[in-house]
């Protein structure tokens, strides 16, 4: 006999990275017929929704109107059908950004390189932080962590055309509080035509994702973001 229901899916709209004082919605998708959803924050019950009619609703939204460092952290959700509870969802790391200062991102030997060249990004921030994050825009992107007193280096090694794209970095004051994003650096990797056609640039977020971070909640893009978010969030942990 089944003791628990399948875990729900949790995500943030428009994004798990939220500029301070902006809004974010945490979505929890369970099953039709769920009579109660619970959102937990850092292990404690945060909010409850009992949708009506439950048989017509399989997703609830928990709205945070004003993001701040107190609201940043790990969220999970569960749902109940009758008296049977689900497994908890995966953890959602909600990050507050635009805290304090803006780092500077640079690339060596430069933003235009030839395939096979060694490339290193440098992220610098003079305020009190020792962890840095380098992000490449795009759904299948990776987040890299780096450490240093005021600067971290991110060696990419010999690059291919797959490394082409737009990069930004953040200083991290803790796992869930990040600086403003750096100005973008667009890396252009030239190679032979055959290689280039085999390695198209990653599909990117809409143009307004960076800087405004999709400030509207009506994007409908979160399922597309899920892969990117999953990668980024694994690195947070």
């Amino acid at each position: 006999q089944q003791q628990t229901l399948p875990k729900p899916f949790i995500w943030a709209e428009p994004h798990f990275m939220v500029p301070k004082e902006k809004q974010v919605t945490i979505c929890c998708q369970g099953n039709y017929g769920a009579v109660e959803y619970q959102l937990h924050f850092e292990g404690s019950l945060f909010a409850v929704d009992r949708p009506k009619p439950p048989e017509r609703i399989n997703k609830v939204q928990f709205y945070i109107p004003d993001m701040n460092s107190r609201m940043a952290g790990q969220y999970s959700c569960i749902y109940r059908v009758g008296e049977l509870w689900s497994e908890p969802s995966n953890l959602l790391d909600l990050v507050v950004t635009e805290m304090y200062d803006t780092p500077t991102l640079s690339v060596h030997p430069g933003p235009e390189v030839i395939s096979g060249e060694k490339v290193t990004f440098y992220c610098r921030l003079d305020t009190a932080t020792s962890m840095f994050l380098l992000l490449k825009e795009g759904r299948s992107s990776h987040v890299q962590r780096g450490y240093g007193k005021v600067q971290a280096e991110f060696p990419l090694g010999p690059v291919t055309t797959a490394h082409r794209g737009t990069y930004r970095c953040f200083g991290s004051y803790n796992n869930h509080a990040w600086s403003f994003p750096s100005e973008p650096v667009k890396l252009l990797v030239t190679g032979d035509i055959e290689n280039t056609s085999l390695a198209p640039e990653d599909p990117t977020f809409p143009a307004d994702t960076w800087g405004t971070y999709l400030l509207t909640t009506e994007t409908g893009l979160q399922k597309d973001h899920a892969l990117w978010d999953h990668t980024a969030q694994n690195l947070l942990r």
Partner: nanobody, 127 residues
Framework: QVQLVESGGGLVQAGDSLRVSCAAS????????MGWFRQAPGKEREFVAA????????YYADSVKGRFTISRDNAKNTVYLQMNSLKPEDTAVYYC????????????????????WGQGTQVTVSS
């Protein structure tokens, strides 16, 4: 923006009942979920009870379940906390809080979920 004013606190004997009220300003009261919290001297503010925008979802702290009842009158812009079988450990300042969720059936349990707070009303239960 909503302003919240609590009233009805006082000094009662253990076992007595008391009803505290929270009046909200403005004409959009029905768009707010409401909660009651309390804070005893030297302790952290703790959740007591909450009511969703439409009143269909209510949620209680285990310590008050079966003794306290939260209700709301959207026509009067007021939320109530009926407290029965009061105990000395219920002594605290009682605060009402409001927030505007997307869902009519949602309530907040954590104080951080709420956007607006009243000044509080003192409830003292003597033994």
């Amino acid at each position: 923006q909503v302003q919240l004013v609590e009233s009805g606190g006082g000094l009662v004997q253990a076992g007595d009942s008391l009803r505290v009220s929270c009046a909200a300003s403005g004409r959009t009261f029905s768009t707010y979920a409401m909660g009651w919290f309390r804070q005893a001297p030297g302790k952290e503010r703790e959740f007591v009870a909450a009511s969703s925008r439409d009143g269909t979802t209510t949620y209680y702290a285990d310590s008050v379940k079966g003794r306290f009842t939260i209700s709301r009158d959207n026509a009067k812009n007021t939320v109530y906390l009926q407290m029965n079988s009061l105990k000395p450990e219920d002594t605290a300042v009682y605060y009402c809080a409001a927030s505007r969720p997307l869902s009519t059936t949602q309530v907040g349990i954590a104080s951080a979920w709420y956007e607006y707070w009243g000044q509080g009303t003192q409830v003292t239960v003597s033994s």
